[in-house]
């Protein structure tokens, strides 16, 4: 059967400062059963964007309703965006474990440029 | 949806036992599973989930009871060894549906099979 | 492991009243909290998610509401087919799920 892949679209996405950036992200299967996560960079040093379970993440929204049945759609937007966020931006699928999950997979990134604001 | 158990009987303590549930009306293999139990009388206890590859169990019954599934026959399994006398219950088969970016919950059971563990 | 409580464990009303019951949880489950009926003889049937969306088909009748650790299943105007027991699931933190102890809704 098919492992479940996780589908970036984009390689990049450019955004003016300011405005909101939307990070497409889909799986390709519910199963195996698990969490996903939104990091910025990769390796030890990663910084989380977004994980729905626990964390408060003010400027980040989730594109499909957090009430959706058997949603695959993982995309996210991040409003006010500066400088400061551009980078590879990574969907990533856990796998289920006890007491910690386990990195299952990841999608190949999305690079995020922002723009000066228009003057 | 249709679910259906099957494999409940009488055991002998120390005895072995393979439920089959044999699932329908939906997309079996994109989904995971679950066995849920309970006892004469008694509340709801969870067994366990399958999702790919992926199984998880309750305390007390792991190490004996083994899950497993066949997509080509849109089958769910529980092997049950080393029965004991608390494990007599009604086991039901349970589809996962899941919300979003959160846990599983159970749309769909079965109407049971009973397993009765006596001497 | 996240323990379920619900109260009362038996609750007799007339046809035609007004149920109300409740789930505790032993810590924040957020939303992540299901209902389920089961009828005598039957299996169990899955009434709301998500703490409060009723399920395809549920009457409306039936209602959720709570989040974190509080919650409650009401049901207005209770119907025949209504007597049953009802069962809260949490699913933001597992393995184990975790079900409650059960609230047994009997005819007054």
């Known amino acids: 059967e098919d492992e479940l892949q996780v589908i970036q679209p984009e390689k990049s996405v450019s955004v003016a400062a300011g405005e909101s950036a939307t990070l497409r992200c889909a799986m390709t299967s519910l199963i195996p059963v698990g969490p996903i996560m939104w990091f910025r960079g990769a390796g030890a040093g990663r910084e989380l964007i977004y994980n729905q379970k626990e964390g408060h993440f003010p400027r980040v929204t989730t594109v499909s309703e957090l009430t959706k049945r058997n949603n695959l759609d993982f995309s996210i937007s991040i409003s006010n965006i500066t400088p400061a966020d551009a980078g590879t931006y990574y969907c990533v699928k856990f796998r289920k474990g006890s007491p910690d999950d386990v990195e299952f997979k990841s999608g190949a990134g999305t690079e995020l440029s922002v723009r000066a604001k228009p003057s | 949806v249709q679910l259906v158990e099957s494999g409940g009987g009488v055991v002998q303590p120390g005895g072995s036992l393979r439920l089959s549930c044999a699932a329908s009306?939906?997309?079996?293999?994109?989904?995971?599973m679950t066995w849920v139990r309970q006892a004469p009388g008694e509340g709801l206890e969870w067994v366990s989930t399958?999702?790919?590859?992926?199984?998880y169990y309750a305390d007390s019954v792991k190490g004996r009871f083994t899950i497993s599934r066949d997509n080509s026959k849109n089958t769910l399994y529980l092997q049950m060894n080393s029965l004991r006398a608390e494990d007599t219950a009604v086991y039901y088969c349970?589809?996962?549906?899941?919300?979003?970016?959160?846990?599983?919950?159970?749309?769909?059971w079965g109407l049971g099979t009973l397993v009765t563990v006596s001497s | 492991e996240i323990v379920l409580t619900q109260s009362p464990a038996t609750l007799s009303v007339s046809p035609g009243e007004r149920a109300t019951f409740s789930c505790r949880a032993s810590?924040?489950?957020?939303?992540?909290l299901a209902w389920y009926q089961q009828r005598p003889g039957q299996a169990p049937r899955l009434l709301i998610y998500a703490a409060r969306i009723r399920e395809t088909g549920i009457p409306e009748r039936f209602s959720g509401s709570g989040s974190g650790t509080e919650f409650t299943l009401t049901i207005t105007s209770l119907q025949s087919e209504d007597f049953a027991v009802y069962y809260c699931q949490q699913y933001y933190d597992w393995p184990p799920f975790t079900f409650g102890g059960g609230t047994k809704v009997e005819i007054k």
């Open positions: 009306g939906f997309s079996f293999s994109n989904f995971a």
């Open positions: 810590q924040n489950v957020k939303n992540d």
């Open positions: 349970a589809k996962d549906s899941t919300v979003s970016w959160s846990g599983d919950f159970f749309d769909y």
């Open positions: 399958i999702g790919s590859g992926d199984t």
